[in-house]
């Protein structure tokens, strides 16, 4: 339960956060599970642990294996596991499944691929894509924040996208890679269920206290007109209008769009001033049509600009 | 936003047992720690323990080891405290208090007064 | 236990001024990850206790900027520039650092 997958490619930064949270942290240390060797935390070594992340600056092979993080409170100490596995790099074009993330499904217009874990690292805006290895070129493209929006997606554009990073670590670079699926889906006018592309699964959105913060729920339906599509944001399974925050209003994005049929819907959570205590609630982005109701939450987590645990762990 | 709902009064004998309750809404229950604290005229606020509702794992003060029991039920979000072998020294508000990912006791609940008389 | 000591009482103040509150702690507060866990509370007449301060100079959400902190590992002062009718009632400290988790005994503050 307390365990999660993590993997890189050598002679590349990788980032793991500890899959256990603080309720609160004090400290968080880490150990190779295996000789239950302490993981140093000076910057000066090539694995080293900073609070609630541990840093392969860069990874080699031979970093394989489980690392066991303990968040400590005086209350409980709570324990997770990484499971990190490093890899060589492929001398061709082909990335094997087993380096992929999660697949995303396309709607025809600004269609956002997603680069994963990017959040864990100090990165500086553009991104580069790769589609099949191949830099992407021409208008259509448009690298934004930390994702790809392909304009009016054709079936053409499905296929494997990787993300290409620097990560900056004290004044030294390191490249980051990030390959996932792309999937349009391409049917004559038909229903299906809902497929929610943002956000992802039990993803973790950084805010700032005291900034605005916009979730967006992004979700397509299948092909033609829908009888019935709705895509909306719940609070602790509350709807928002239900739920008497006036802080935190959802409004309609990007309605249905039909250049190429597929059908889809956005709805922006906008949450203004974030207080601590929206840390704590569960944000789940419901699509639902007749075929059935599908659920992606998203929970927050805060941003420090300089995070003591980091420093002093 | 986070309420803390506990139960009401209570006037209860002197030797016999009593649970108060505290109902959590507005956040993911298994992501906040429960901690339990008694005030008293005499002894002001004195921590009695708490609960990591994720796990069931507790923690006491060492004042209140065998006083106090605590309980948590993922399924209602309800956090619960036992009183046992009660005294007039037992009687006092009795608050729970829920901790964020920073900090412990950031949320109260309303308290609970507790009368031990015969 | 560490033990939280404050006075009983505050020197009273006249709404509009400054007023400070003290507290003292048996040994430091100060963590080895840097952070001073200190806390302040306001209990004001029949309600529950309400965080205000946290981590010995962090504002708690919805606490107005009037109230402020400072200190050491061990000595430490509860700051507010513009006292408010609302203010009224009994300041707590406490410390976070190690169980068992204790308070002070708490400050009323006391208006002219």
């Known amino acids: 339960k307390f365990s999660k997958q993590s993997w890189g490619l050598e002679n590349e930064a990788l980032i793991v956060r500890c899959p256990r949270q603080g309720k609160p942290s004090y400290t968080v240390d880490w150990y190779y599970s295996q000789t239950n060797k302490s993981i140093p935390t000076q910057e000066r070594n090539r694995v080293f642990a900073s609070g609630q992340l541990l840093k392969f600056l860069p990874a080699a092979v031979a970093d394989s294996g489980i690392y066991t993080c303990i968040v400590r409170s005086p209350t409980f100490n709570r324990t997770g596991y990484a499971n990190v596995t490093i890899y060589k790099k492929q001398s061709d074009c082909n990335v094997p499944d087993y380096l992929m993330y999660s697949t995303v499904s396309g709607s025809e217009k600004n269609s956002k691929i997603y680069c994963p874990t990017i959040d864990l690292y100090n990165w500086t805006a553009p991104l580069e894509w790769f589609k099949n290895c191949q830099a992407l070129q021409g208008s259509r493209y448009r690298a934004h924040k930390s994702f790809l929006v392909i304009d009016n997606v054709m079936t053409e554009d499905a296929g494997d996208y990787t993300c290409k990073f620097i990560h900056n670590e004290n004044g030294a670079n390191y490249s980051v890679t990030a390959t996932r699926s792309f999937t349009v889906k391409d049917e004559q006018g038909f229903s299906l269920f809902p497929v929610i592309g943002a956000p992802a699964q039990n993803e973790i959105k950084e805010v700032e206290i005291g900034k605005n913060a916009n979730l967006t729920c992004s979700a397509c339906f299948g092909k033609g007109t829908q009888f019935l599509a709705a895509v909306l944001w719940q609070l602790n399974g509350t709807k928002i209008t239900d739920f008497g925050e006036p802080r935190i209003q959802q409004e309609e994005g990007q309605n249905q769009s039909f250049s190429n049929g597929l059908a889809c819907l956005d709805m922006v959570l906008r949450i203004a001033d974030v207080k601590e205590e929206d840390l704590l609630l569960q944000y789940d982005c419901l699509a639902l049509n007749l075929h059935g109701l599908r659920r992606h939450t998203v929970r927050l987590s805060r941003k420090n600009p300089i995070d003591h645990h980091s420093i002093y762990c | 936003q986070v309420q803390l709902q506990q139960s009401g009064p209570e006037l209860v004998r002197p030797g016999a047992s009593v649970t108060l309750s505290c109902k959590a809404s507005?956040?993911?229950?298994?992501?906040?720690?429960m901690h339990w604290v008694k005030q008293t005229p005499v002894h002001g606020l004195e921590w009695i323990g708490a609960?990591?509702?994720?796990?069931?794992?507790?923690v006491y003060n060492q004042k209140f080891k065998g006083k106090a029991t605590l309980t948590a039920d993922k399924s209602s979000s309800t956090a619960s405290m036992e009183l046992s072998s009660l005294t007039s020294e037992d009687s006092a508000v009795y608050y729970c208090?829920?901790?964020?990912?920073?900090?412990?006791?950031?949320?109260w609940g309303q308290g609970t007064t507790l009368t031990v008389s015969s | 236990d560490i033990v939280m000591t404050q006075a009983a009482f505050s020197n009273p103040v006249t709404l509009g001024t400054s007023a400070s509150i003290s507290c003292r702690s048996s040994k430091s507060l100060l963590h080895s990850n840097g952070i001073i866990y200190l806390y302040w509370y306001l209990q004001k007449p029949g309600q529950s206790p309400q965080l205000l301060i946290y981590q010995m100079s962090n504002l708690a959400s919805g606490v107005p900027d009037r109230f402020s902190s400072s200190g050491s590992g061990t000595d430490f002062t509860l700051r507010i520039s513009r006292v408010e009718a609302e203010d009224v009632g009994v300041y707590y400290c406490?410390?976070?650092?190690?169980?068992?988790?204790?308070f002070g005994s708490g400050t009323k503050l006391e208006i002219k």
């Open positions: 609960i990591d509702p994720e796990t069931g794992d507790t």
């Open positions: 208090t829920g901790s964020t990912t920073d900090y412990y006791f950031a949320y």
């Open positions: 507005g956040y993911i229950f298994i992501d906040s720690e």
């Open positions: 406490a410390q976070n650092l190690e169980l068992p988790f204790t």
